[in-house]
Amino acid sequence: SAHAHPRDSCPLGPGRCCHLETVQATLEDLGWSDWVLSPRQLQLSMCVGECPHLYRSANTHAQIKARLHGLQPDKVPAPCCVPSSYTPVVLMHRTDSGVSLQTYDDLVARGCHCA
Amino acid sequence: SAHAHPRDSCPLGPGRCCHLETVQATLEDLGWSDWVLSPRQLQLSMCVGECPHLYRSANTHAQIKARLHGLQPDKVPAPCCVPSSYTPVVLMHRTDSGVSLQTYDDLVARGCHCA
């Protein structure tokens, strides 16, 4: 459409609103170095940024929350940027019998929204 | 168990950590008075409060987020308090043909966690 929908255009400027960002983390950072063998470093996608009024609202509840936050900011928090979906991640880890692959469904964010 | 798990005991004091809270809102507050007929006032359960380290972590991603926030607070936000489930709510609303009941699955929070 000619005008960007408020749900998708960030009124705060580029990169300020809720979006997916890659964060590098080592196994040591995560406290996993004693049981995860590989990879030594992970590219973790996380949800960061602000949730201005109606931006990427997760659902009706989030829309209401945004509206009530405008009316009662001390009582109702603004929506916040959280994962809407995840990408499965495979890690190689130590087991009693040797080495095994394990897949985590909820480790790396794939998309973000304001909830 | 004898000791409360860090996921469930709030280190910040009573009522400070992520929990469900009831917020009163009128149809006017919500901007719904032109199409919702009843009820005139809603009891909305919302998720409020802080998410200290590992408190009510939604999943592995939230645990990692909490840990990385401790290491890189400027880059990685703390987890935040969002609904983990919803309670269906029935509203009576105006339609072209009269009055109808409609159920909303994602309007009122039923439980909260830190994501």
Partner: antibody
């Protein structure tokens, strides 16, 4: 561009061993794992195992433990799979495939056709 | 081991058609499913991972969907170069396993 080069064919006697290679180019070899997959004539695909190319950790399908041994040579960006005590059941096409943590088997070699025959 | 079942060994289609290849897992695999295209004498080509994410360079007529136990690869506007065998694969738990394959043929 990413390429995984495998020899076209190997002919081996029953009871013997074979070591097949998979030479990687077009990316940093140690940034990805290397998987091996078997396809018998007219049949589906079977995952054999995986090797971490930087640390040489290996994880095998239980079915291929004792049959397959995975190794790497970082200096030549080459992964190897040795198959021992060969029988006619081992006659198949063997593929190497690059793998990551989220993109699982994104690039495959052309496959080596192993024929076990006297 | 998790069994991946592709109940249709063969599917007939025409150029321009829309076709759906299905795959069923014997237990919940979340979205840890990938799809591959294989032509005779060639290596498999990766199409989809994480059930619905297309690999770079894969035409958008290929769409993956599903979660849990039921998965679908849909090819809209089938082209002649799409006539091949399609395999699903789970990577939810080791050992990783593949479906038996579905061959897409011309009517």
């Amino acid at each position: 561009q990413v390429q995984l080069q495998q020899p076209g064919a190997e002919l081996v006697m029953p009871g013997a061993s074979v070591k097949m290679s998979c030479k990687a180019s077009g990316y940093t070899f140690t940034d990805y794992w290397m998987h091996w997959v078997k396809q018998r004539p007219g049949q589906g695909l079977e995952w054999i195992g995986v090797i971490d190319t930087s640390e040489s950790y290996t994880s095998y399908n239980q079915k291929f433990k004792g049959k397959a041994t995975l190794t790497v040579d970082e200096s030549s960006s080459t992964a190897y799979m040795q198959l021992s005590s060969l029988t006619s059941e081992d006659s198949a096409v063997y593929f190497c495939a690059r793998g990551g943590t989220t993109v699982v088997l994104d690039y495959w070699g052309q496959g080596t056709t192993l024929t076990v025959s006297s | 081991d998790i069994v991946m079942t592709q109940s249709q060994k063969f599917m007939s289609t025409s150029v321009g058609d829309r076709v759906s290849v299905t795959c069923k897992a014997s237990q919940n695999v979340g979205t840890a499913v990938a799809w591959y295209q294989k032509k005779p004498g060639q290596s498999p080509k990766a199409l989809i991972y994480s059930a619905s994410t297309r690999y770079t360079g894969v035409p958008d007529r290929f769409t993956g969907s599903g979660s849990g136990t039921d998965f679908t690869l849909t090819i809209s506007n089938v082209q002649s170069e799409d006539l091949a065998e399609y395999f699903c694969q789970q990577y939810s738990s080791s050992p990783w396993t593949f479906g038996g394959g579905t061959k897409l043929e011309l009517k």
